[in-house]
């Protein structure tokens, strides 16, 4: 390093097609007295020394082309008030050239292989001609501050295209380049950047959630799809159609869109793109039940957090099967699904399934002409003890004087399993409690032979994990048949 306060080193290189020589240095301490530069040919005219005056307060100067011979070697030094400013520098005019910027062509080829890649063609600088240059390229997102350098550096004798990999979809990028004489210096300036936009990716997987094939009129369906790049904010265009009717929904956020009634097909495309790609086209036509899978079975998978699903083929072989599942009470857009080839008649659903939580699992056969779904099955990874008991109420006596009671179902999320049986309990004041188990298919009980007095009744429900707590008490008074709730 040079001593503090001493002038910075002198740098010289030829620039541009006219071949002028540009010399620069760090500003001098004494700005009033202009320095003088000298240069001497070392190859062709060793006895000739040229003097170049520098304008005041300027820390650079150009040496006109007529003062030197191309391909010469020059010795250059400088003085101020007759005193030397720097160590003299030797400049090889063959290698110390600062090339012009490379030309980057605006045609950008983008491929969607495993990752999004862009390829750009380029041309070497016009100057210096007939020299092999090494060129370096860099790219960045348009809004980013920092650039990423591309490796390897490219030579002008091969003109390999510039390749950028792992790009994000739907994003603006800039690319620029600079060149240097092979085995020379300095680098040329960076070219002004070429901007280009990567396309949005098509959604990877489109499915329908809800009751698209519901015949009871409660048809509420949602088109859902998987975001190819969850980190990128993208809107989609969704088309629905039936016969000659097509409806378009634009600027749809990821990743759902309500299905209008009676639609027969749906297409999802990113942004305002109009390229309809077959994988995103879904037929919404409901096919005959015999085309649907049958004998769907669900079980907890041994030694794994997943859920096992099996089924049998319907009357014909589909293009594929889709198994979808959702937690009880979840909204339509909370659906998970997986696609399986037609030869697969079982799958292990991936993910963490919580114990005591009911999952609605549906197997659908997908045909070119539409869908055929098997009836949904409610399954559990593990059953737990119920959190609540059923509410009990009184029905009209049958026969008169013989009370009849009924009880409701415990909501699925509180039941936490399948009801194996109910336990009906009755307690008379001052006497012990009598309980009896009744089938899970039964939700009424007749109470014959009750003596006069007051009684408390309650019901519990059991799953395979055990008996739940009692539901609310029903107070019963005989013979006046009045009901009081606790």
């Amino acid at each position: 390093t040079r001593p503090h306060g001493s002038p910075g080193p002198l740098q010289c290189y030829s620039v541009g097609p006219l071949g002028i020589l540009n010399c620069s240095w760090e500003p001098l301490g004494d700005l009033e007295t202009p320095p003088v530069l000298y240069h001497q040919s070392q190859k062709y005219h060793p006895n000739r020394v040229w003097e170049v005056k520098v304008p005041s307060k300027q820390s650079w100067v150009t040496i006109p082309r007529e003062q030197f011979t191309m391909a010469d070697k020059l010795l250059i030094w400088g003085t101020q008030k007759g005193r030397p400013l720097w160590s003299s520098v030797s400049v090889n005019l063959e290698t110390q050239m600062k090339p012009d910027t490379p030309q980057i062509f605006s045609q950008v080829d983008i491929s969607e292989e495993a990752t999004l890649e862009a390829t750009v063609q380029w041309a070497p600088p016009v100057w210096p001609p007939q020299k092999v240059l090494i060129c370096q390229f860099r790219y960045k997102e348009c809004q980013a501050e920092t650039w990423t350098r591309l490796e390897p550096q490219l030579k002008t004798d091969g003109l390999t295209p510039v390749e950028m990999q792992n790009l994000e979809p739907g994003t603006c990028y800039q690319v620029s380049g600079r060149c240097q004489v092979e085995n020379g210096y300095p680098w040329g300036e960076w070219s002004s950047p070429l901007s280009f936009q990567t396309p949005f990716l098509d959604p990877e997987d489109v499915w329908v959630s809800g009751t698209v094939c519901e015949t009871s009129g409660k048809r509420a369906a949602l088109l859902v799809w998987k975001d190819p790049r969850p980190c990128v904010q993208v809107t989609y265009t969704v088309w629905f159609g039936a016969g000659d009717i097509t409806t378009t929904q634009e600027e749809v956020p990821c990743c759902k869109s309500p299905v209008p009634a009676w639609m027969e097909w749906a297409v999802v495309s990113p942004g305002n793109s109009t390229s309809w790609v077959p994988p995103t086209n879904l037929s919404l036509v409901c096919l005959a039940p015999e085309s649907a899978p049958c004998d769907v079975g669900v079980s907890s998978a041994d030694g794994s957090p997943g859920i096992k699903v099996t089924w049998k083929q319907g009357t014909r072989k589909p293009l594929e099967y889709v198994v979808d599942w959702a937690q009880d009470g979840d909204s339509l857009d909370k659906l998970n699904w997986t696609r399986l080839p037609p030869g697969n008649l079982s799958t292990l659903l991936p993910g963490e399934f919580k114990g005591g939580v009911p999952y609605r699992i549906t197997v659908t056969a997908v045909y070119s002409g539409g869908l055929a779904a098997a009836p949904s099955v409610w399954g559990f990874r593990e059953e737990l003890v119920p959190l609540a008991g059923p509410a009990v109420w009184r029905l009209p006596d049958d026969p008169p004087g013989t009370p009849v009671v009924a009880w409701g179902e415990v909501p699925r999320h509180q039941l936490r399993g399948q009801a194996t049986h109910y336990t009906f309990c009755i307690q008379s004041r001052g006497l012990s409690t009598v309980c009896r188990n009744v089938s899970s298919q039964t939700q009424t009980a007749t109470l014959p032979n009750l003596h006069l007095g007051s009684f408390k009744l309650w019901v519990t429900v059991s799953t395979v994990a055990g008996q739940g707590p009692p539901g609310p008490n029903l107070s019963l008074h005989l013979p006046d048949n009045r009901i009081r709730w606790k």
Epitope: V296, G297, S299, V377, F380, V464
Partner: nanobody, 123 residues
Framework: QVQLQESGGGSVQAGGSLRLSCAAS??????MGWFRQAPGKEREGVAA????????YYADSVKGRFTISQDNAKNTVDLQMNSLKPEDTAMYYC??????????????????WGQGTQVTVSS
Amino acid sequence: QVQLQESGGGSVQAGGSLRLSCAASGYSINRMGWFRQAPGKEREGVAAISIGGGQTYYADSVKGRFTISQDNAKNTVDLQMNSLKPEDTAMYYCAAGLVYGEAWLDSRHYNKWGQGTQVTVSS
């Protein structure tokens, strides 16, 4: 952990009867079934029952001859086999699982299995 233990197998003449019993302990399962495997053949489902619910399901080959039932007091599931035929000869296995839907006799859903009991029917 579910433990299953079969009993009641043996030899019988065609047309005779046998009663197989499967004792289950420590279970958190909702279906139990009987499966059988004859030498050189695949395992096949015979009958299944939902625990508590009492729903039953039978293979076509045993309908009307076999009856599956549960005894809550003894924690057992029994298979009463009447009108036995030589083709009923096999090793009989009791199985249990947490199973939902219509796959009553699909062995893939039953993850607890007994050791098996041999049934031989001679003509």
